[in-house]
Interface confidence: medium
Amino acid sequence: EPKFTKCRSPERETFSCHWTDEVHHGTKNLGPIQLFYTRRNTQEWTQEWKECPDYVSAGENSCYFNSSFTSIWIPYCIKLTSNGGTVDEKCFSVDEIVQPDPPIALNWTLLNVSLTGIHADIQVRWEAPRNADIQKGWMVLEYELQYKEVNETKWKMMDPILTTSVPVYSLKVDKEYEVRVRSKQRNSGNYGEFSEVLYVTLPQMSQFTCEEDFY
């Protein structure tokens, strides 16, 4: 049966919900899938279910709620129906489903190189996603930077920060690194997708190498 896979708000002003539409062998044709939503109010004695306002904008098997249909103040309930019967249902508040778009415009600058030329420190900078209204205070984002050597599989995670730049220390100068950043709403929601990977190549800085490394 169709099931909700994800509801997501990128900026607390709109949201969309997605569902699977797999037809399993041996199951009868369910007919067209419809999404209905309601906001719970006890004074509306019969819950007022309304159909999805926009099945197109968020892609296939989805429903998009623009800013006219989105409010942070009260939870939503949504249900998937087919042939008049409910096949899946869930309730949430908008703040619970916030997943920001990826940070953008990643770049790096060299901070310093060790005396031996073996290690270097860099400063990584990025920008908040365009639709996260940081200036207005409408979203307060927390960022997580991860980095690794290109040939490694495991990412090193840095502690979450509220700023849009962070120093990364003691990288090996003869290696190439991948850096990526993701963000989440502070004290709420889940991390969004990672940014595009930033490649950091630190060319060899000196002709000699040394067993010990002094700064």
Partner: antibody
């Protein structure tokens, strides 16, 4: 008992600054949205700004955006409204009010208000 | 922006009268409307929230209702202490809260 007490109002010249305080008791400001609402003499109510100190969210009316800053100090259980570049049209009684909070069944409203503090902008 | 158009701006009534004040939202606001009472020199007091829910401690002669984008505050039998100014307010919009212009209820 829930109580909100505003202070910091007074007479200020156009272009001047003032900082209003809203001391809360009987609840934690970190658990609620705190709003400022103003009322010009003989006029209606105008929403000014709100803050959620837990999430760090703030929002402002267009008429004060870029000039006013709302903040909160959870250790003092107090919200603030920093008002810069004040204009004659900012003259009003300023109220802080508590937003009743998000519920599964009800839309929120201002359930508690302070007594108000008068801000007069005049040369 | 969502406008809340309140009417009438003032009305004269007698004790015991049934009084109706209306507010029309410029777009759908679900049931996200509250009503407040304000007396001169005092802070507003919450009467009705979520369009029709009576706030704790408010007399039952006050009631609220909704029909689409039209909201109504009714005082079934006006009492001497009810002479005041009444405001509607929408809280549907997540980052912009708006009030109606107010209705002054005066003694006839």
């Amino acid at each position: 008992e829930v109580q909100l007490v505003e202070s910091g109002g007074g007479l200020v010249q156009p272009g001047g600054s003032l900082r209003l305080s809203c001391a809360a008791s009987g609840f934690n400001v970190s658990s609620y949205y705190i709003h400022w609402v103003r009322q010009a003499p003989g006029k209606g109510l105008e929403w000014v700004a709100y803050i959620s100190s837990y999430y760090g969210y703030t929002s402002y009316a267009d008429s004060v955006k870029g000039r006013f800053t709302i903040s909160a100090d959870t250790s003092k259980n107090t919200a603030y409204l920093q008002m810069n570049s004040l204009r004659a049209e900012d003259t009003a009684v300023y109220y802080c009010a508590r937003w009743s909070g998000t519920s599964e069944y009800y839309w929120p409203a201002f359930d508690y208000w302070g007594q108000g503090t008068l801000v007069t902008v005049s040369s | 922006d969502i406008q809340m158009t309140q009417s009438p701006s003032s009305l004269s009534a007698s004790v015991g009268d049934r009084v109706t004040i209306t507010c029309r939202a410029s777009q759908s606001v679900s049931s996200a409307v509250a009503w407040y009472q304000q007396k001169p020199g005092k802070a507003p007091k919450l009467l009705i929230y979520s369009a029709s829910s009576l706030y704790s401690g408010v007399p039952s002669r006050f009631s609220g209702s909704r029909s689409g984008t039209d909201f109504t505050l009714t005082i079934s039998s006006l009492q001497p202490e009810d002479f005041a100014t009444y405001y509607c307010q929408q809280s549907y919009h997540s980052f912009l809260i708006t009030f109606g212009q107010g209705t002054k209820v005066e003694i006839k």
